[in-house]
Amino acid sequence: RDCAEVFKSGHTTNGIYTLTFPNSTEEIKAYCDMEAGGGGWTIIQRREDGSVDFQRTWKEYKVGFGNPSGEYWLGNEFVSQLTNQQRYVLKIHLKDWEGNEAYSLYEHFYLSSEELNYRIHLKGLTGTAGKISSISQPGNDFSTKDGDNDKCICKCSQMLTGGWWFDACGPSNLNGMYYPQRQNTNKFNGIKWYYWKGSGYSLKATTMMIRPADF
């Protein structure tokens, strides 16, 4: 069902695995990190080189896009169903262009169903990427270029690019434009995690991963 189950079934090597939706036979391919922090992590987002366009539609963010071996978005529907079955933690791993790494760990993470636009719910932040959550709390509805559910007259997803849980527009967007080194500062629409690197810094790499809290 998820990478934690795959791990527990004896598959302890990083790689792409076929997962199934809860209470369904529908399948989805995901990258499983079986080494970091004890393994069993389902990767739900990865940015690393700008090879994939993240300015996608609501339907694309719903079902997922990209390549699990590289840059990709796993899909809001799968993540919503998974995280409403049991308690999950969310770990966000970040890299800047100067060789630094940081993370934010939320001890409870889930997405509402599509009915409430995959609204994000987070509790219990720890980690090195800021003492304040760069995902606005309480959580907001997900927005895309064709689904404007934010709290700004500016249409955050169109202005900042990418689908995200925008507020107005808020202190983060890990699905923003990918900017290469030396072009990554003073970018309002880049890959942003405000409480680590500030507002204009666009990150080199990001990974969002989830795992059952009782793993």
Epitope: W58, N117, P138, D146, G147, N149
Partner: antibody, heavy 120, light 107 residues
Framework: QVQLVESGGDVVQPGRSLRLSCAAS????????MHWVRQAPGKGLEWVAI????????YYADSVKGRFTISRDNSKNTLYLQMNSLRVEDTAVYSC?????????????WGQGTLVTVSS | DIQMTQSPSSLSASVGDRVTITCRAS??????LAWFQQKPGKAPKSLIY???NLQSGVPSQFSGSGSGTDYTLTISSLQPEDFATYYC?????????FGQGTRLEIK
């Protein structure tokens, strides 16, 4: 400019059916969610239902669930509300409203409404 | 369901007055709040969404504020065309619900 024009309102007996229509113009209909909202005579506003831009999701108020069906025909730029098993308490002016986006749950434009009277 | 309670239910004011209408939700709604204006026999007009964002074409004498469960609509200087009934609406969760309305009359 955005225009929403409802039709189909009538006087009907309890238990009967009625279908309301909302003709939309002045915008790309297929890019927006649409709602039905009603207002009983001398009363406040009550949300009835929403349909997403592509018809993929529909949600209803408990008071109409199982009796009313919202639908749309994007090729005709028209929204519908099929009302079955009508009750006296369904008497109201029914208005269609455009969602701010595909599913934001708030509205930016409303129609004038069409009156449905359920009476024996 | 989330109950929305508006106050006052009616008020009288004069042209040029500053008027405040409040709306209280039965639970926190995280700024998912809109305001509408309705005149007799007319369709409601959307004024504000997400607590404080003015809809396109809405005059600047209207403003909104609030957080958690308590929200406010302010008309800074009443114009003759502002006399109407005002409704708040929460869209934090389904079902979408409205306040009972505030009738603003000429004194």
């Amino acid at each position: 400019q955005v225009q929403l024009v409802e039709s189909g309102g009538d006087v009907v007996q309890p238990g009967r059916s009625l279908r309301l229509s909302c003709a939309a113009s002045g915008f790309t209909f297929s890019s927006y969610g649409m709602h039905w909202v009603r207002q009983a005579p001398g009363k406040g506003l009550e949300w009835v239902a929403i349909i997403w831009y592509d018809g993929s999701n529909k949600y209803y108020a408990d008071s109409v669930k199982g009796r009313f069906t919202i639908s749309r025909d994007n090729s005709k730029n028209t929204l519908y509300l099929q009302m079955n098993s009508l009750r006296v308490e369904d008497t109201a002016v029914y208005s269609c409203a455009r969602d701010f986006s595909i599913s934001s749950r708030h509205f930016d434009y409303w129609g004038q409404g069409t009156l449905v009277t359920v009476s024996s | 369901d989330i109950q929305m309670t508006q106050s006052p239910s009616s008020l009288s004011a004069s042209v040029g007055d500053r008027v405040t209408i409040t709306c209280r939700a039965s639970q926190a709604i995280n700024n998912y709040l809109a305001w509408f204006q309705q005149k007799p026999g007319k369709a409601p007009k959307s004024l504000i969404y997400a607590t404080s964002n003015l809809q396109s074409g809405v005059p600047s004498q209207f403003s909104g504020s609030g957080s958690g469960t308590d929200y406010t609509l302010t008309i800074s200087s009443l114009q003759p065309e502002d006399f109407a009934t005002y409704y708040c609406q929460q869209y934090y969760i389904y079902p979408i619900t409205f306040g009972q309305g505030t009738r603003l009359e000429i004194k």
